[in-house]
């Protein structure tokens, strides 16, 4: 007889994949635009990375370091109006993506809880939170809690708010902390809280720290849904040279959790080689027209439009990576065991139940490697097979579909490696 | 308070290799953004290298690229720069210096090790 | 790259004197996404290292005196020392941080009548 199927686990929409934050409307949309009207013509873009929610704003009102002049329910004019607003919600349910609001209160401001009136700043939180459910909003994020007095308790309370509505609701917070404990004492008190930070900032680049710090990480927090990314708002060109990004997209989409990103993430956008443009947030590269300040600085692989033509584009790896991870069981909430294969390696499987398996491969050093997996580091239910199919490499030349024997394994430079495997009784 | 001290400064002929480095103290190294920048003989203050907190990202100004590497040993709570193929427009005091955040401004520099570029 | 230009280069002071001396940018350093503005001054006393001063164009460094003033936004900037003392005198650097990379100043060396 066949075994009993295990039972699903329940499922929220911010479990179902990756979420995309645009914190800066302006340079998301570029040539002088960037308002709500805006953003909504490029909702079909985001669509097209199968990213399952939008992180958006602030876009509210914030006098510089004013309390009295800080107003969470009025979107600033210069991003548009409430009725903007409600019409890109309206077309962003349409389209299966969901908006999570950014309202940390002081976002132009020195520290963006100010400095004082803890308590003031908290109603207005709790008012907005309350207005916005209203409104339709999906969820919230709230950033720098590192500058928030006795943010977990305030954490706590916008959670019972947020959950009371709905269950569906979500709440991210965010800090620049990259320390586990400090995480962790945010965590504890904040059941579903979804947290972004910096803490795999500190990977150094080599995969035995990153495998640390995941198995670490995951350890810490038992059965608890996670997030990554690798901070609270910055691009991962902030973090990693371009011949890493491929391996950590491959990496933040198989981890169990959900994956974070900025926008312009999905096609290596960095600040440092756009001369003039805000480190902040640099104009997004829609096509070569999108930084006319210096002629010949943006050539069309660096963009949108010219990697959206090119299959072998870091583009195209995140919309396959984003697609494979909405639709498969084992990607979705599947176990995760790590185990050796050999220095300079983190890998991984991920498995449930009957469903097609999957083994992540990452070779984070600058020299090829031949992969010496450690079987006997997993568990009877998650046991390796001889051979496994390619689902795809971070880099070009690879013959997808086609079977790979594990103990022959072999990996070029920072490249990663997705293979999928049938379930054997 | 935080210290920064930096060493490796030499007298190297044009064409020559130097490494410099910086040790760190009494702070948490391994989650600070570090930089390193030098002041010419004339006193230009002049930004050569930045590199992230966990080492995966380095940028460096026209002038240095392909010449310069930073690099950092977080164990070690030391930053390096590697200098190659120097030139005389090179010679200058190099200070390592902590950023904020990950604003390339810099609210602590180190006391600054001599170059000096010369045939 | 963004050139920041100071000026003057010199300033000879009586101390008591208030003094302003100027840093302009060649382009905005105010970023409309959090209307901060990315710049920074310092201060460098002959055979020391910079010590900062003033950071997003008006805060002051903790420990800085109040008779530093950081002003202005977009383009055009001034520190102001409201009653100079005869340990202000030193080199004044300005420091964009806007993007990369981030440039300098040639200085104003502030000297005693």
């Known amino acids: 007889r066949a075994p009993r199927c295990r039972e699903l686990p329940a499922q929220k929409w911010w479990h179902t994949g990756a979420l995309y934050r645009i914190g800066d409307l302006q340079a998301f949309q570029g040539h002088g635009a960037g308002n709500l009207a805006g953003l909504k013509g490029r909702l079909d873009y985001l669509s097209s990375l199968k990213v399952k929610g939008l992180v958006l704003g602030p876009i509210h009102k914030n006098q510089k370091d004013d309390v009295a002049q800080t107003d969470l329910l009025q979107i600033d004019p210069n991003f548009g109006s409430k009725e903007d607003f409600d019409s890109l919600l309206q077309s962003a349910k349409k389209k299966s993506i969901r908006v999570i609001l950014d309202l940390t209160p002081n976002y132009r401001g020195e520290n963006s809880w100010f400095s004082t009136q803890v308590d003031t700043v908290a109603t207005k939180v709790k008012d907005a939170l309350e207005f916005w459910l209203q409104a339709g909003v999906d969820g919230f994020q709230v950033r720098d809690i590192e500058n928030l007095k006795d943010a977990s308790s305030f954490l706590a309370e916008w959670q019972n708010i947020t959950k009371g509505f709905s269950e569906d609701r979500l709440l991210i917070a965010g800090t620049n902390s990259s320390d586990l404990q400090q995480i962790l004492s945010l965590l504890e008190s904040n059941k579903d809280l979804l947290l972004t930070s910096s803490y795999l900032s500190d990977s150094g680049s080599t995969g035995e720290h990153t495998k640390s710090l995941v198995t670490q990480y995951l350890n810490a927090t038992g059965n608890r849904w996670c997030s990554w990314s690798l901070s609270q708002a910055r691009l991962l060109t902030s973090f990693l040279p371009a011949q890493l990004l491929r391996l950590y997209q491959l990496m933040l989409f198989t981890l169990p959790g959900t994956p974070v990103f900025s926008y312009g993430d999905e096609i290596g956008l960095d600040a440092a080689a756009l001369p003039g443009q805000p480190m902040e947030a640099p104009v997004m590269l829609w096509d070569e027209s999108s930084f006319p300040d210096i002629p010949g600085a943006v050539s069309a692989n660096m963009t949108v439009k010219g990697q959206s033509e090119d299959p072998g584009s870091l583009l195209s790896l995140f919309r396959r990576l984003s697609d494979q991870r909405s639709k498969e069981r084992s990607l979705l909430h599947g176990d995760f065991h790590a185990f050796s294969a050999g220095p300079g390696l983190f890998s991984y499987i991920r498995h449930w139940d009957q469903n097609e398996r999957f083994l992540v491969v990452l070779n984070f050093g600058d020299v090829g490697l031949s992969a010496g997996l450690q079987a006997s580091d997993l568990p009877a239910s998650a046991s390796l097979p001889a051979k496994a199919d390619l689902l795809l490499s971070t880099q070009p030349g690879r013959e997808e579909g086609s079977p790979l024997e594990l103990e022959r394994l072999k990996l070029e430079p920072h490249e990663g490696l997705l293979l999928r495997f049938p379930y054997a009784a | 308070e935080v210290q920064l001290v930096e060493s490796g400064g030499d007298l190297v002929k044009p064409g020559g290799s130097l490494k410099l480095s910086c040790t760190a103290s009494?702070?948490?190294?391994?989650?600070?953004?570090m930089s390193w920048v030098r002041q010419t003989p004339e006193k230009r203050l002049e930004w050569v290298a930045y590199i992230s907190s966990g080492g995966g990202s380095t940028y460096f100004p026209d002038t240095v690229k392909g010449r310069f590497t930073i690099s950092r040993d977080n164990a070690k709570n030391t930053l390096y720069l590697q200098m190659s193929s120097l030139k005389s427009e090179d010679t200058a005091m190099y200070y390592c210096?902590?950023?904020?955040?990950?604003?390339?401004?810099?609210?602590?520099w180190g006391q600054g090790t001599l170059v000096t570029v010369s045939a | 790259d963004i050139v920041m230009s100071q000026s003057p280069s010199s300033l000879a002071v009586s101390v008591g004197e208030k003094v302003t001396m100027s840093c302009k940018s060649s382009?905005?350093?105010?970023?409309?996404?959090?209307?901060?503005?990315?710049l920074a001054w310092y201060q460098q006393k002959p055979g020391q290292s910079p010590k900062p001063l003033i950071y997003?164009?008006?805060t002051r460094e903790s420990g800085i005196p109040d008779r530093f003033t950081g002003s202005g936004s977009g383009t055009d900037f001034t520190l102001t020392i409201s009653s100079v003392k005869a340990e202000d005198l030193a080199v004044y650097y300005c420091?964009?941080?806007?993007?990369?990379?981030?440039?300098f100043g040639a200085g104003t060396k502030l000297e005693l009548k």
């Open positions: 382009q905005s350093l105010l970023y409309s996404g959090n209307q901060k503005t990315y």
């Open positions: 009494r702070f948490a190294f391994s989650t600070y953004d």
């Open positions: 210096a902590r950023q904020d955040g990950h604003y390339p401004w810099f609210p602590y």
């Open positions: 997003w164009a008006s």
């Open positions: 420091q964009q941080y806007y993007s990369y990379p981030p440039t």
